[in-house]
Amino acid sequence: DAHKSEVAHRFKDLGEENFKALVLIAFAQYLQQCPFEDHVKLVNEVTEFAKTCVADESAENCDKSLHTLFGDKLCTVATLRETYGEMADCCAKQEPERNECFLQHKDDNPNLPRLVRPEVDVMCTAFHDNEETFLKKYLYEIARRHPYFYAPELLFFAKRYKAAFTECCQAADKAACLLPKLDELRDEGKASSAKQRLKCASLQKFGERAFKAWAVARLSQRFPKAEFAEVSKLVTDLTKVHTECCHGDLLECADDRADLAKYICENQDSISSKLKECCEKPLLEKSHCIAEVENDEMPADLPSLAADFVESKDVCKNYAEAKDVFLGMFLYEYARRHPDYSVVLLLRLAKTYETTLEKCCAAADPHECYAKVFDEFKPLVEEPQNLIKQNCELFEQLGEYKFQNALLVRYTKKVPQVSTPTLVEVSRNLGKVGSKCCKHPEAKRMPCAEDYLSVVLNQLCVLHEKTPVSDRVTKCCTESLVNRRPCFSALEVDETYVPKEFNAETFTFHADICTLSEKERQIKKQTALVELVKHKPKATKEQLKAVMDDFAAFVEKCCKADDKETCFAEEGKKLVAASQAALGL
């Protein structure tokens, strides 16, 4: 479906409001340091140009690609060189190299101030004064901090954000109404960003085949009644959508996502019985709902997998004729029977099956060679099962905060070179697996836990890639996408690590800790814990627990004192001395 003017085509398909929002997201994800006003100006210029193309598709420059139009616009920013340094060199390149260059300069951890939430009355006034600017600012602030956020989904978040303010700013108790909603949006937003980051990493670092394999497994679990052909079609379309969004082609991505939702709803009879409610919703809610829909029930009477993939005399013939299609069928058949497995486990099984066929189909007696292939799956299945069982027991025993601390110690000992803020952030998120997944029955624990851990470990991988400091992290992150978690689990204490010099300043605390929220206070304590382990990697659990208990008592005592600052200064010195003695520093 070639269009004379791509920009006119997308403007007409998406409508002005979505067009402007998506262009703003795209620009903010590329130029993460630019002020809001500059982006709004660029977006307005692009929108006015798009309107001229809608009026006359043959008008000057209307035939240019979106990358060319958007790239040219970004390259008009006057302060590009001083704000972004070498990113300005992208502007000397031609498309498609220029866009690739912009993509490579996306920063997963931009040096931006933390978003501080103003008072509710201040927010409500701003919302009422200029609703459009208020919502644009939300898109801008999220997009620049999360340069891979799934753009059509961000439109859905913005819609909910608007609804929250519309409802709560006229409520009797504005804060009681609004704050829980904003907390929920923030937490869901962070989770959504991290999930999408893994999809983009999968596509960009491991290629389309890796993403398609993931999609076959996940969609087969979700739509077990759908035929292989149907799943294959959905996988192809979904891959296109995510390739576009991860590549910065946000208008095409949003348009194609809408088409995919339309197709799924028009064909729900042959896809899933669980889609009815989703398909009655408006577009943004519909797409979100489909993406989160529960797994359909498995069809009755599915035969044993062995008949097709072990016992059949045609296994090697089928494999040789179309390797990826046959492996896709294996993954489809296995995944639809196993909603209780994580996607990454299913992909490990498929990889094992592929490796076995590669070896056995060249052997003298192929059938004899691959006859026991399913036996090789047993340890692969048991490993995550046992790990989840052990960690859920630990979580139930300790509670979330102390479970996070156990993981902080574990991961700091594995990869002590990683920066303290990254170790704290990643370990805190790893620790959330407990409250997120351990409440589930056995059949839902593994897909919840291991696929969540894949998302969190990807955060570690992308943050580490920016400033690599550990060969072990690089190795686990780059060797195999599906084996990242087992790779990190298998790491022992890094014996090559030279302990960090002791610095009393790291363990000096002030009265400001008393006014922090519980979460911020936890982060302070967890930061100190990581630093302790970096100073004394061989410290035992008991030693670390004793020091942390003393530390908690010290903070509690000084926060109750009349002269807090003096207490922190004097008692802090004693605590540092006692800790040094306890740990033999």
Epitope: F228, D301, S304, F309, N318
Partner: nanobody
């Protein structure tokens, strides 16, 4: 457009055998599980059997288990149903349909009639 052409039916005595065929066109045959269903005179549609995409895995209704065998030849886009030890209650119009154990209405071809009578 999806087309399924059944053949091989006929009149047979109880205890006899038949082999039904179904040639598929208009879709990627090897990417679909396939099924046979039947409709006895004056009755509703009854599922008979299904075969997996690859062709090794099969499933049968209790009423035909051990007597009927389903297979497929993906290279020829053809589905088969071998009917042995036929009984009078097997008398029906037999249709092949796309999909595993179909529990949603699907378009039917013209079918092939199997009559078991002495």
């Amino acid at each position: 457009e999806v087309q399924l052409q059944e053949s091989g039916g006929g009149l047979v005595e109880p205890g006899g055998s038949l082999r039904l065929s179904c040639v598929a066109s208009g879709f990627t045959f090897q990417h679909y599980a396939m099924s046979w269903v039947r409709q006895a005179p004056g009755k509703g549609l009854e599922w008979v059997s299904s075969i997996s995409v690859v062709g090794g895995g099969t499933s049968y209704a209790d009423s035909v288990k051990g007597r009927f065998t389903m297979s497929r030849d993906n290279a020829k886009n053809t589905l088969y149903l071998q009917l042995n030890s036929l009984k009078s209650e097997d008398t029906a119009m037999y249709y092949c349909v796309r999909g595993w154990h179909p529990d949603v209405p699907r378009p039917l071809g013209q079918g092939t009639l199997v009559t078991v009578s002495s």
